[in-house]
Interface confidence: medium
Amino acid sequence: EEELQVIQPDKSVLVAAGETATLRCTATSLIPVGPIQWFRGAGPGRELIYNQKEGHFPRVTTVSDLTKRNNMDFSIRIGNITPADAGTYYCVKFRKGSPDDVEFKSGAGTELSVRAKPSAPVVSGPAARATPQHTVSFTCESHGFSPRDITLKWFKNGNELSDFQTNVDPVGESVSYSIHSTAKVVLTREDVHSQVICEVAHVTLQGDPLRGTANLSETIRVPPTLEVTQQPVRAENQVNVTCQVRKFYPQRLQLTWLENGNVSRTETASTVTENKDGTYNWMSWLLVNVSAHRDDVKLTCQVEHDGQPAVSKSHDLKVSAHPKEQGSNTAAENTGSNERNIY
């Protein structure tokens, strides 16, 4: 009689994560008597997957009834497959022995490959805010996919970006892979409402890419522009000076009025108006009693925006130009003497 052969007809099996893998194995003879065992890998470090004789293998079921005397089908099913299950599985026939069974013959092996979907891409931006015209980096990460082949694209407001670098790890064979990409984006003043999108396409997704997004409102800081103007005299000896704080983002802003370098009032921006581009405007005014001053008054509007160094704009109020009579035509100068370049 011909010697027993262990036949594993499938060289490879491809299974999606979460599915059940069927690993086929048949023997050509009932002799010699002895159990079948399944292993992942070969050699001394191989991992026992199923033992017909003993043990508890909750994820493994046999395709046919191994207790039947004439059974020669030793195929198994492994449930709830994960990428960690990938590898080469061997069906091994043992000969009954004493005290231990002896390995008799092994099948050629079946390589189990696991198709796993990538995780939803996570996009993260810089830790600190940046101002327009600066280049900032965004990273995108997705994990746990297999096979290794994957495509990643970056978009800003629907326009594809080209300045990015992508790595898929590990470089060699692995049960699953991760992708990491870094894109560079140049900020503009209009980017408060902008969005950066990372799109990942993988064979398991069938044309429906996964997307991760980041809002540039979390990244951008648009510094304010300041304008100090003198309003018509409200009452005798009183001048209303306003400080227009325009086009800033985020809203966090503190304004201090200085009269000849001395703090007059400090306030926090509260009732701001929002512009179409997402930036804010705010106005503060100061009522100056001209009669309380003998000399000209230097009024300074000093703004601290989002924890940045203060920017300021000054206005010289000529006291001599304010006679006690009606002073609606008073001369006023906006010297901008303490103006700072805030870009």
Epitope: L14, D149, T151, E160, A201, Q206, G207, D208
Partner: antibody
Framework: QIQLVQSGPELKKPGETVKISCKAS????????MHWVKQAPGKGLKWMGW????????TYVDDFKGRFAFSLEASASTAFFQINNLKNEDTATYFC??????????WGQGTTLTVSS | QIVLTQSPPIMSASPGEKVTLTCSAT???????LYWFQQKPGSSPKLWIY???NLASGVPARFSGSGSGTSYSLTISNMEPADAASYFC?????????FGGGTKLEIK
């Protein structure tokens, strides 16, 4: 080996219905999308849309909405393409093509449809 | 939709000649999603070049692809009779996916 085998040529009259099949073998059918492409006689290729073989959700190009339908029989690893109320301009060869990261890596041999009164 | 224009529509080349086919897009196409297909009369198209510059299995090394944005090309370094066919560029960067009108390449 991977194969996409399409049904044979069809001769139909205007107003009739035709259903073309595309049987896949050599790979797990539900792992790859299936796309349909039209090629009118002597003309170029026109992508018509695709069907997600996992969810059976079809996507049609605007020009192929209404009279056209993609469907599946996943247990038989087969995709179908149906045209209702046939018109003369439907005369063409229709191809199924496997999707995935290598879009169009395998194509059916094509099914020639002739619509004539 | 993105319209792909191939030029020239028809061309003939002598054996050994260098041939360049171009594909121009009306808006930017991701290089990862720009493919070329070869089709011979009576046959289905064959994937020839994927992701702008990668040769599909079995494609001779005399073929190459390049390009980015709205301009792509397929080059044959030295034409052979077996290369006589129609070549179509294809984008699946954005819906609806589209093909170019094709270039019919003949042998002189």
């Amino acid at each position: 080996q991977i194969q996409l085998v399409q049904s044979g040529p069809e001769l139909k009259k205007p107003g009739e219905t035709v259903k073309i099949s595309c049987k896949a073998s050599g790979y797990t059918f539900t792992h790859y999308s299936m796309h349909w492409v039209k090629q009118a006689p002597g003309k170029g290729l026109k992508w018509m849309g695709w069907i997600n073989t996992e969810t059976a959700e079809p996507t049609y190009v605007d020009d192929f909405k209404g009279r056209f339908a993609f469907s599946l029989e996943a247990s038989a690893s087969t995709a179908f393409f149906q045209i209702n109320n046939l018109k003369n301009e439907d005369t063409a060869t229709y191809f199924c093509a496997r999707g995935g990261l290598r879009q169009g890596d395998y194509w059916g041999q094509g099914t020639t449809l002739t619509v004539s009164s | 939709q993105i319209v792909l224009t191939q030029s020239p529509p028809i061309m003939s080349a002598s054996p050994g000649e260098k041939v360049t086919l171009t594909c121009s897009a009306t808006s930017s196409v991701s290089a990862s999603y720009l493919y070329w297909f070869q089709q011979k009369p009576g046959s289905s198209p064959k994937l020839w070049i994927y992701s702008t510059s990668n040769l599909a299995s079995g494609v001779p090394a005399r073929f190459s692809g390049s390009g980015s944005g709205t301009s792509y090309s397929l080059t044959i370094s030295n034409m052979e009779p077996a290369d006589a066919a129609s070549y179509f560029c294809h984008q699946w960067s954005s819906y609806p996916y589209t093909f170019g009108g094709g270039t019919k390449l003949e042998i002189k």
